[in-house]
Every structure is written in C-alpha cells, then in structure tokens.
C-alpha cells in the first residue's frame, strides 16, 4: 500500500521538516525560516509560534516542531500548551478585573493564583478553632470542645496572626 501511495502521490515521500512544493514539480523543499512541518507529506509548512510580550520561549521552533512558550515571570500559564498568560497575585489575594485584591475577611488564598476560599467551619465537624485563619491561611481545627474537659491538656494557640479571625460559625 505504501509503495502504491508513493507512486500515486510523490508528496508522501516528503519527510517532516519539508513540504511538497507545487511550484517546483512537487519536489520536497525545506521549510522556510520560522516555519515547520511536524509530519511527512505536507504541502505547506506551518508558521512558528512567536513567544513575545507576556510569553517567553521555552523551546525554540525547529524545522520539525513548533516553538513552545511559557509566561514571563509575574504571570503564569493557562490553557493547553500555555495558550494564555494570567497575572500572579500575592498569597492572601485573588485576581479580579481590577487587578489583585485582598481576600475578604473569612476567606483565604495560600497560592499566587486562584480565588479566595472560605475558612473551614470547624464546628461543622464538631471541632473548635485551634489556630485563627488569616488572608493567607485557613483556620486550624482542634479537638472538639467536649474533648477539652477540665483537667485535659489543651494546646496553647499561637499569637494571633496579622489579621486574626475565627471561622464563620
């Protein structure tokens, strides 16, 4: 079958990194600069992706493979193949259309991306707040109040954080 196909279609003999040039009697011509073909038998080469501005080059384009981009520091990749770059924020913030904004009281974000999430409600699990939540950290739940009967040893909570707060009860 392969022999038959190559007799019928001379383009099938053109390897990756070349294209079947109709203007030159279907000769296999190398891809021009800034273009590539990742499979054989192609009649055109694809233009290389340009990584500029918010994007930076992770892997250069070659005659057989496209360039790969990531994001300039201060931004992070979104989408398949890093199709978009999105702004980083600080911990304790979330990204909005107005830029990075502090998490509202009762919520936290411990990453440079993503949204602020509500503090854990310790009482739902029958537990008490051992360490207060902050904009950057969730509350730490401790033993249930019943476990802290008189005489039982309890953990001394650390000093309050910058913006102390209890889980919404």
């Amino acid at each position: 079958f392969e022999r038959t196909r190559s007799l019928q279609d001379p383009c099938s003999n053109c390897p990756a990194g070349t294209f079947c040039d109709n203007n030159r009697n279907q000769i296999c011509s190398p891809c021009p600069p800034n273009s590539f073909s990742s499979a054989g038998g192609q009649r055109t080469c694809d233009i290389c992706r340009q990584c500029k501005g918010v994007f930076r080059t992770r892997k250069e384009c070659s005659s057989t493979s496209n360039a790969e981009c990531d994001c300039t520091p201060g931004f992070h990749c979104l989408g398949a193949g890093c199709s978009m770059c999105e702004q980083d924020c600080k911990q304790g913030q979330e990204l909005t259309k107005k830029g990075c904004k502090d998490c509202c009281f009762g919520t936290f974000n411990d990453q440079k991306r993503g949204i602020c999430r509500p503090w854990t409600n310790c009482s739902l699990d029958g537990k008490s707040v051992l360490v207060n939540g902050t904009k950057e950290r969730d509350v730490v739940c401790g033993p249930s109040p019943a476990d802290l009967s008189p005489g039982a040893s309890s953990v001394t909570p650390p000093a309050p954080a910058r913006e102390p707060g209890h889980s919404p009860q």
Partner: nanobody, 123 residues
Framework: QVQLQESGGGLVQPGGSLRLSCAAT?????NYWMNWVRQAPGKGLEW???????????YYVDSVKGRFTISRGNAKNSLYLQMSSLRAEDTAVYFC????????????????SGQGTTVTVSS
Amino acid sequence: QVQLQESGGGLVQPGGSLRLSCAATGFTLSNYWMNWVRQAPGKGLEWVANINQDGSERYYVDSVKGRFTISRGNAKNSLYLQMSSLRAEDTAVYFCARGGEGYGVDHYGLDVSGQGTTVTVSS
C-alpha cells in the same frame, strides 16, 4: 495573522507625558478586553490597566491611578495609554495585550501581545 504593534515610547523627563499606541491587525479590537502590562528593568511583568469592549469599564494598578488613562479607538483598531506626571519608577517596556476568550468570566488570561515599546523616565 493576529498581531499587536506598540509605538510611542521614548525618553521623557520626570513629570512629563507620553502617549503610547497599539495597532491591532488580524482581529477586531472592539470584540475584546484589552490590557497594558509593563516590565521594568530586572523585574517581573506587571499589569498596568485594562479596558472592556466598549470602553465603559477601565481599571488601573494603584501606582498609576490618576496619572495614566487607557482608551481605545475602535475605528482605527487601536489601543492607547496616555501617561502623565511620569516618574522614574515608570521606566519599563510597555506591552499591549489582548484578553483571551472568556476574559473576566472564567479567567484573566492574555493570549496575544506585542513586542513592546520602551519608556525611559530620566532627567
């Protein structure tokens, strides 16, 4: 081919003004949120301002509020950044960038940006 090309950068004294332009080709600017971002020497990329499709929403990073104005000339398929009361800390390469599909709803990702134009504020 979808492209953005910035222009208008240069050397300006502290307190001076500049107007940056960004010309879009290969797509209709009025269909997208548009942004300006900048990169100061040796620093990471910083978001500066954005504007929605019809220009009714405009937002700025705190450090430029009251000094910079983002605008769009949809008829010319162009984006602008008017910069006044410039400071040394505004020295950077400025890029215009397009908000990707779903910007402001699912994400705040930028999918196309230009090569940048350099602004130097120095006496």
